[in-house]
């Protein structure tokens, strides 16, 4: 089981993302998933306001939090 989410540093700017390393934010289901498990494009579910692009926020360089920490993050790079 994965530990808690970590703030991750992008290449261009110190923008945190919610996902642990090796996970991507899936813009369809709106939560973190294993990057290799991103599914093929399909229509956004009923009730959605607009079509979501079938892409993901990609983690770049990990910025590890404290060892053993399992808490959901407070974004520290705002």
């Amino acid at each position: 089981m994965r530990r808690g989410p970590r703030s991750l540093r992008g290449r261009d700017a110190p923008a945190p993302t919610p996902c642990v390393p090796a996970e991507c934010f899936d813009l369809l289901v709106r939560h973190c998933v294993a990057c290799g498990l991103l599914r093929t494009p399909r229509p956004k579910p009923a009730g959605a306001s607009s079509p979501a692009p079938r892409t993901a926020l990609q983690p770049q360089e990990s910025v590890g939090a404290g060892a053993g920490e399992a808490a959901l993050p407070l974004p520290g790079l705002l």
Epitope: M1, R2, A15, P16, T17, P18, C19, F25, L27, V29, R30, H31, C32, P45, G47, A48, S49, S50, A52, L57, L74, P75, L78
Partner: antibody, heavy 118, light 107 residues
């Protein structure tokens, strides 16, 4: 420290429009992956997810209530809003706002109570 | 929509007891499940996220487990402050949904 606080009118008459505000601190809705949503709970009953808005302005609504709901945000003021048109007595409930950041809802407000009565 | 079912709506236990609360999903939710505690005053707090990860500040007597469609929350030794209603929540697919809640009382 992440905090959220809901505010609303307290009492409305049937057919009026409910306007709720969620004011938050400790995070920014401009952060990638961040979202804030609304959940309600009629007295003595369970939780019902109503609507959610994300940093990229994508919105999602409970399909059974979608025609009555509008969610919006003011990122610079750290606020999220929910409007429910044509309220009925069935909309009497405690309304919560809550944050999401990649793994479902994590931090919740204290709730604001709405009574719809003629 | 994914239906979340908590078959036990109320549960009575003694202080110090080990308590397990169950939740089942109408389809596989791949561990995308959280547990919340709602105190009698209405305050809602996250206890466990992603099936088994303990949220910040939550006592270690709380734990979560499960996979596929079946999940559980365990309190290893019941304390007076644990009197509350507990809800499961799936965020595998939109719309996100909740179980009906399990109200925990002291015998």
């Amino acid at each position: 420290q992440v905090t959220l606080k809901e505010s609303g009118p307290g009492i409305l008459k049937p057919s009026q429009t409910l306007s709720l505000t969620c004011s938050f601190s400790g995070f920014s809705l401009s952060t990638s992956g961040m979202g804030v949503g609304w959940i309600r709970q009629p007295s003595g009953k369970g939780l019902e997810w109503l609507a959610h808005i994300w940093w990229d302005d994508d919105k999602y609504y409970n399909s059974s209530l979608k025609s009555h709901l509008t969610i919006s945000k003011d990122t610079s003021r750290n606020q999220v809003f929910l409007k429910i048109t044509s309220v009925d007595t069935a909309d009497t409930a405690t309304y919560y706002c809550a944050r999401s950041f990649g793994y479902g809802l994590d931090y919740w407000g204290q709730g604001t109570t709405l009574t719809v009565s003629s | 929509d994914i239906q979340m079912t908590q078959t036990t709506s109320s549960l009575s236990a003694s202080l110090g007891d080990r308590v397990t609360i169950s939740c089942s999903a109408s389809q596989d939710i791949s561990n995308y499940l959280n547990w919340y505690q709602q105190k009698p005053d209405g305050t809602v707090k996250l206890l466990i996220y992603y099936t088994s990860s303990l949220h910040s500040g939550v006592p270690s007597r709380f734990s979560g487990s499960g996979s596929g469609t079946d999940y559980s929350l365990t309190i290893s030794s019941l304390e007076p402050e644990d009197i509350a209603t507990y809800y499961c929540h799936q965020f595998s697919e939109l719309p996100w949904t909740f179980g009906g809640g399990t109200k925990l009382e002291i015998k």
